[in-house]
Structures are given as structure tokens and as C-alpha cells.
Amino acid sequence: EAHKSEIAHRFKDLGEQHFKGLVLIAFSQYLQKCPYEEHIKLVQEVTDFAKTCVADENAENCDKSIHTLFGDKLCAIPKLRDNYGELADCCAKQEPERNECFLQHKDDNPNLPPFQRPEAEAMCTSFQENPTSFLGHYLHEVARRHPYFYAPELLYYAEKYNEVLTQCCTESDKAACLTPKLDAVKEKALVAAVRQRMKCSSMQRFGERAFKAWAVARMSQRFPNAEFAEITKLATDLTKINKECCHGDLLECADDRAELAKYMCENQATISSKLQACCDKPVLQKSQCLAEIEHDNIPADLPSIAADFVEDKEVCKNYAEAKDVFLGTFLYEYSRRHPDYSVSLLLRLAKKYEATLEKCCAEGDPPACYGTVLAEFQPLVEEPKNLVKTNCELYEKLGEYGFQNAILVRYTQKAPQVSTPTLVEAARNLGRVGTKCCTLPEAQRLPCVEDYLSAILNRLCVLHEKTPVSEKVTKCCSGSLVERRPCFSALTVDETYVPKEFKAETFTFHSDICTLPDKEKQIKKQTALAELVKHKPKATEDQLKTVMGDFAQFVDKCCKAADKDNCFATEGPNLVARSKEALA
């Protein structure tokens, strides 16, 4: 229904706390360089204004759209051009173009230092002194680094953060309590960030239809007992919610997400038998719980879908009458029977089926033509199954760090033009798939591996789009979203690449490496590995193993030496010389 004042409506629906959190996220995602203090001032002004509109919906400016109100706030910031350059040009535009302009200026790789977690004692002190401000800083820091983070989900992580601090700050060993718990929240949040970025990419590049297809497949897997009409309704609602969040309409997105959770809990009987536990929780946990819900049990007896989609002589007639509904039904029926497939695979199968019908229904004997489609599905199914098998075997053999290194070599050979930090980040994330997925039961491996890899590769594409350097990467990133992972997997060594000159300084290390945390040490070593491959793209596995083994020994030896600086200064050049020789 239409409301006189959109902002008053959202304030009342969401409540002050969530309203303020969402406004802070919105501002932090749009203006990523502004300090917390500046944003919190704007948040307070917007909140005060919303309260006046709640009191009187006819008050001045209360009828304006939220985009207009937020945009006006952002454009009123002094020195906007000094800090943001051409983003200030957006302010000359009218809505909705102004908001579109802001969206286009979101930076997926902002020049911000990595978020450093303070010492446990310091964290607890500032948390206990002012929990609201502490959690506000958390929202601000995450949102500005991840401008597409799913806002209502970020509120959930802030709540988790709050729970951990409340629990651990009363313990005697605060650090021992905080570190593993906060690491777990961070890991989940980082995965959530890349997954949501993938959804926004899908929405931006391929529109609502592509996202809705993704949602139909996912919902059908989770809720195999729900009717197609129910799945369609859920997918339509989820598409609207994600469109809003990806478009910066965070208040509407969060409000609609809460509505969807309410609907699902009121209609459990027609959706899934697994929802009750989620439905007993408060709103943020409820929505999150529903988003992560386990698959319902598949009906005991589901017939083959061949009768409706391959054997029926009327397939072309049914397809022509309502193409999207027919294909949607195919995707629904296939997906509810295959929770063991990735959504990407299910969408590739649906795409192949659509292409087959387009071709066959124009021919003289359509049934004979589309009757062979099942054989064409086989390679599509077997390719990702083999990918999972070979990669999980490699992970089990090498462990996470070794597996990351194997992927780093592979991807540096595929796209040596890509910057080393981007390659290292991508390989480290891709390598985590082993820990995340390979330990799962067989039926869960494929969806876990492929859908996670797709999200990580989307991040690589988003970063590469900003500064394109590799034709091969551009080619894989330009195609359909569901074909990306197979496209990257099929890439081989880039024969057009002219190897990088050997620069001794690239492989020169100092004693500061000794005091780095393990993760940073790994990144240093992986940076060296990528540079080695860029210098010698055709180096064999044994050559790289030798050089990296030497390097690890060298670091270990010098970090144990009495005079570390002297050791690095004298042993370093020897290492460089030996490495050059080993790779010659």
C-alpha cells in the first residue's frame, strides 16, 4: 500500500535500532572514505528527521523518497569533490539517475588498510564503555570495505559480534575466548560478502530473470515438498529483496526480508517441515536461520521427469505457450530431485534444455530431436563432479596452504598479467574451498565447491573489470555467470605472455618477516611464488617446489639467527642466485 511518508513507514516497521544501523550501512557503502564520526552525524540527522515524520507524516519533506533524502544528505557533505572526485558529479543529477550514479561509483577494492582487530583488553574496554558506538564502528568498517554486503545480514553479524563480546569480556582470559569466536564470525561474514556480491553481479549484468532462475533452483533444492507456485512466490519475493539491497534501497530491503520471513513462518505447512526452530527466533536471527536452513526431506516417491520433458509429444506446444513457466517448471522439478547438484550446474542444465527446445521445436521431427537431450546432459554433470574429485584429492594430499599454492601456480599461469595481490587473494580464497567443502558428506560437496568457487571467481572478475589486463580473464568474465567457473577451469597456460624480467628486489626479504603473523608470512611467500611463476611461467612443479623449499628454509634459518638483519643481508643474495639457477 502507498504511504504518505516512506521514511516514517520504514522507521515504524524496522524500529529505531535497526533503522539507524541500516542508514549507517547505506552511507558507509556509498561514501567509503568518510570517517565514522561524519557518517554517524548524518545518521543522527536522518533519524531525527524520520522521527518528525513519524509524529506528523505531512511535515515538510516527509513525502520525499528515501533516495532523495539520502542523496541530498550525501551531496551536502562539505569538500565532497576533494575527497571523492567525480562522484561529486552525481550530485548534479536528479533521482533516479543520481542514485544510479552513486551505485556506479561503489569501489569493490577501496584503498583502505586491512581492518585490524584491537587487543582483547582494549576491545573489551571500548565495548563496555559504549557498546552502541563500538558496534557502529563495526558496521561502518565492514560496510565501507564491502559496499554490496547484504545489509540485514550485516546487522545480524553485528548482533553476533555483540554476543561474543558480551560473553567473552567477563572472562579472565579474554583473548582465548574472543579470538576463535571472532575468527568464526569474520570467516562467515567474508563468505557472505562474496556470495552477495555474486548476487548483485547477477542482477546488474543479467537482470531479474537470471536472479530469479537462481532463486527457483535454490528454493526447490531446499523445499522439495513445496508446490511450484509456492517456490515461484518465494523466488519472486527474494528477487525483489535482493534487487533492493543491491540497488541501495536498504530500508525497504530489510523490511521486505522481515516480511518474507514472517510469510514463511505463517506458511510452514506448504513450504517445509524444517522451519519451526527458525520461526521461534527474533527477526534478525529468524531471517538468517531461514537463509541457512537445511534441505527438507525429498518426497519418498518422485516420478521421473522424462515423461513431461522428454517423452511427451506435446513438449514444443507446452514450451511455446509459456516459455518461462515451462522452463521454470523444468528447473523446479530437476532441482528438487537434486540437492546434490550446484545451482550453477542446474542452471547450465536448464540452459542446455532451453537451447535444445529452441533448436528442436523448429525442426521437422521435434520429439526425435529433443529425445537425445539426456545424453547431452552427461558431460555437463560429469565435468563438475570430476573437478570436485580431483581438487578434493589434491587438498587432502597437500593441506590448505599447499592447495592454495597449487591453485596460485595454476591461476598465475592462466592469467599472468593479473596483479600479484589479486592473484594471491583469489588463490587463497579458492584454496579455502578444500577446508570448507571437501570434508562434507559426498552429496554436499559439489554444491558447496562449485557455488563457492563461482562466488570467488566473481570477485576476481569484479576486480579485473576495474583494470582489465588479461584477455582470457575478460573472456571468461564477459560470458554467462554460470559458465564462468567451467571457463576458468578450462584455461591453460597463457602462451602469449612475455615472462617478467627477473628483479632481485622482488625476492629480497628482511628481518621484519620474522615478526609477522602466520597469515601474513604465508602471503609474503605466496607473493614470491606468484612472481616466480610470472618470471618462469613454464617452470615445472619440481622446480617451484625446490625454490620455495629453499626459500622457507632461508626464512626459518635467518629468523632463528642471532643477527637476523645480517643473515638476511648475506644469505638473501645467495638464495636469489640459487633460485635463478634452479629455474634456468
Epitope: 525429498i298 516417491d301 537434486h338 546434490d340 539426456l374 559426498e442
Partner: nanobody, 124 residues
Framework: EVQLVESGGGVVQPGGSLRLSCAAS????????MGWFRRAPGKEREFVAA????????YYADSVKGRFTISRDNSKKTAYLQMNSLRPEDTALYYC?????????????????WGQGTLVTVSS
């Protein structure tokens, strides 16, 4: 893990009958679609018949319809293939397969576990 062992194969005259059994161990079969496939000498493996988890749906290749019957007894963890009116062209190695998830029933790539096979020879 499911281990499947076929039995009941042998030599039979054209027009004769055989009953193949597929015994599962290691897990209950009630959560699996069960199927029979065969490979004739020098030919590709082909689908013969399949049955849904609780037996409500059965599927057959056109070449065996009306002659073969697939059934299952989940309590005995066994699937069966009753083969009547056998023909020389039915000569093949018959494999039993189990698939947790299946959309088509007839596609070998949807089956996760396979037996070693039992040989059926139809000859006069």
C-alpha cells in the same frame, strides 16, 4: 557407502526366464532409486529398468517393456529383476545400481553405486 552384489545370472534358452537379485550392504536402500543396466559384448552400457525409493514408480527401456519386471524389498535391502521371454539379444552383463538422487531414472550418471555385474546368456 553402499555395496551391491548381483546374483541369479546364468545360461538360459530363448523364451526362458531368470530372476536377478541385487543385495545391498552397508546402508539401507530405502533412500535410493534402484536401477538395472546391461552391457552386451562390444556395446555401450544401456539402461534396462529402474524403481523409485518405495516402489511406487517403475521405468523400463522400450526393448524390455512387457517382458521384464523390476521390484524391491527394502526390508531385505534387495532389488529384483524378473526377466521373462528372454531373447538372444538380451545376452549381456547385468549391473545393479543405486542412486540417492534421480530426475531421469534412466541415466547412468545419476547413480552413485554399482555392482560388479552378473552374466546372462540367452542361447539355444
Amino acid at each position: 557407502e553402499v555395496q551391491l552384489v548381483e546374483s541369479g545370472g546364468g545360461v538360459v534358452q530363448p523364451g526362458g526366464s531368470l530372476r536377478l537379485s541385487c543385495a545391498a550392504s552397508g546402508s539401507t536402500i530405502s533412500s535410493y532409486v534402484m536401477g538395472w543396466f546391461r552391457r552386451a559384448p562390444g556395446k555401450e552400457r544401456e539402461f534396462v529398468a529402474a524403481i523409485s525409493r518405495s516402489g511406487g514408480y517403475t521405468y523400463y527401456a522400450d526393448s524390455v517393456k512387457g517382458r521384464f519386471t523390476i521390484s524391491r524389498d527394502n526390508s531385505k535391502k534387495t532389488a529384483y529383476l524378473q526377466m521373462n521371454s528372454l531373447r538372444p539379444e538380451d545376452t549381456a552383463l547385468y549391473y545393479c545400481a543405486a542412486g540417492r538422487y534421480s530426475a531421469w531414472y534412466s541415466q547412468s550418471y545419476e547413480y552413485d553405486y554399482w555392482g560388479q555385474g552378473t552374466l546372462v546368456t540367452v542361447s539355444s
